[in-house]
């Protein structure tokens, strides 16, 4: 969490951003909130990016003002216009790419004063893993697959019964570059699996951590998976 305050001149207002991560090939949100003003026409929102000459986005007098917008953000940005009045200056970014990573500044002017806060935006790829029993294998084997990750993640297997066990000797992980030559498909195979046990395939990079669980019994197979973004620090 980054909390910024205004500088000299008029009164300062509090602006708060949250460091976040964008999944390339999806829309992303850069979070920013501020002390609201009662009059929309008095609010100015400017988003800037370190190293970029033009503005990322500008909203003033109740509408978008994009004449100074940098070419790399043309057609891609939006604020939530109906939520500006309640202090939401968050930015929606269409079709996030690796090059969108960097330091952004959310700069606010209201009738109460000015304020700004920086935001670190990371970009990469992350996806939910799916764990299945590999019936083609000669022994009891599990196969964990996740379609798109970047940067290259680590994959660790764990089991409920053998807690703390190191499965690196009985697992094999491969990374296959996807057709767009950025993201990679993750495939990890775990050998010598025992029945009546729950196994977890954990995939992690500096942006996200995802886990796929599978419980194999004689009568059924239960699966569960979840994904968590790692770097949600507010400022």
């Amino acid at each position: 969490l980054i909390i910024g305050f205004g500088i000299s001149g008029r009164h300062s207002i509090t602006v708060t951003t949250v460091a976040s991560a964008g999944n390339i090939g999806e829309d992303g949100i850069l979070s920013c909130t501020f002390e609201p003003d009662i009059k929309l026409s008095d609010i100015v929102i400017q988003w800037l990016k370190e190293g970029v000459l033009g503005l990322v986005h500008e909203f003033k007098e109740g509408k978008d003002e994009l004449s100074e917008q940098d070419e790399m953000f043309r057609g891609r940005t939006a604020v939530f216009a109906d939520q500006v009045i309640v202090g939401n200056a968050s930015l929606r970014l269409k079709n996030v790419q690796l090059t969108d990573a960097g330091t952004y500044k959310c700069y606010i002017i209201t009738s109460k004063g000015k304020g700004n806060a920086n935001l670190e935006y990371k970009t990469g790829a992350f996806s939910m893993p799916e764990v299945n029993v590999d019936y083609n294998a000669s022994s009891e084997t599990l196969r964990c697959e996740a379609p798109r990750w970047f940067p290259q993640p680590t994959v660790v297997w764990a089991s409920q019964v053998d807690q703390g066990a190191n499965f690196s000797e009985v697992s094999n992980t491969s990374f296959e570059l996807n057709s767009e030559n950025v993201t990679m498909k993750v495939v990890s195979v775990l050998y010598n699996v025992t029945i009546n046990n729950t196994y977890s395939c954990m995939i992690e990079n500096d942006i996200a951590k995802a886990t796929g669980d599978i419980k194999v019994t004689e009568s059924e197979i239960k699966r569960r998976s979840h994904l968590q973004l790692l770097n949600s620090k507010a400022s």
Epitope: N23, I24, G25, E26, D27, H57, K63, D64, L66, R74, G75, R76, T77, A78, V79, A81, D82, R92, K94, N95, A125, S127, P147, R148, N178, S179, E180
Partner: antibody, heavy 116, light 109 residues
Framework: EVQLVESGGGLIQPGGSLRLSCAAS????????MNWVRQAPGKGLEWVSV???????DSADSVKGRFTISRDNSKNTLYLQMNSLRAEDTAVYYC??????????WGQGTTVTVSS | EIVLTQSPGTLSLSPGERATLSCRAS???????LAWYQQKPGQAPRLLIY???SRATGIPDRFSGSGSGTDFTLTISRLEPEDFAVYYC??????????FGQGTKLEIK
């Protein structure tokens, strides 16, 4: 040259299935938001489905549960699997790339007629 | 659900005249996500304007877009014979994800 070419349209009976294809050249499908848009005879444009660069998909309520958008990255091709077809699905179906600057590349369209 | 309403439904003008087409949204639309398309009979639509006011590649400068919030305008400063067609506005980002207006037919008077 950046191009999209649709195929797979035809005459189909109500309740039937059809798969449309859209072959892309000059750009990588999986880096863009790829869409299917349709136009019923004498009517306006109606958005049908999108597949994001990430592979996630979304569809209009009118086709949810019946139509499935997908892509084959190795073939650089977009698909629309249409099941449980109805008379109101009769239209010209276009695939379109939504680059950063709107739907800037369109195919020539393929005609789907649903009739008994 | 966001609805885009275009007016007029049909616009009858002569070559050389100025055309003003309107697109009104039922709720606020980001300027970045508002586009205009031209469609001629038997052809696929063609992107004219993106980001409410930026001309797409190869589009003549007689076409211009303006507006913000809920009211957007496409202006053709001096009509050429090839400009007579149907024009659609389109938004991105709300539910449904993409929405088109019903179209304005620009015909020769």
């Amino acid at each position: 040259e950046v191009q999209l070419v649709e195929s797979g349209g035809g005459l189909i009976q109500p309740g039937g299935s059809l798969r449309l294809s859209c072959a892309a050249s000059g750009f990588i499908v999986s880096r863009n938001y790829m869409n299917w848009v349709r136009q019923a005879p004498g009517k306006g444009l109606e958005w049908v489905s999108v597949i994001y660069g990430s592979g996630r998909t979304d569809s209009a309520d009118s086709v949810k549960g019946r139509f499935t958008i997908s892509r084959d990255n190795s073939k650089n091709t977009l698909y629309l699997q249409m099941n449980s077809l109805r008379a109101e699905d009769t239209a010209v179906y276009y695939c379109a790339r939504d680059g950063d600057y709107g739907m800037d590349v369109w195919g020539q369209g393929t005609t789907v007629t649903v009739s008994s | 659900e966001i609805v885009l309403t275009q007016s007029p439904g049909t616009l009858s003008l002569s070559p050389g005249e100025r055309a003003t087409l309107s697109c009104r949204a039922s709720q606020s639309v980001s300027s970045s996500y508002l586009a205009w398309y031209q469609q001629k009979p038997g052809q696929a639509p063609r992107l004219l304007i993106y980001g409410a006011s930026s001309r797409a590649t190869g589009i003549p400068d007689r076409f211009s877009g303006s507006g913000s919030g809920t009211d957007f305008t496409l202006t053709i400063s001096r009509l050429e014979p090839e400009d007579f067609a149907v024009y659609y506005c389109q938004q991105y980002g709300s539910s449904p994800l993409y929405t088109f207006g019903q179209g304005t037919k620009l015909e020769i008077k």
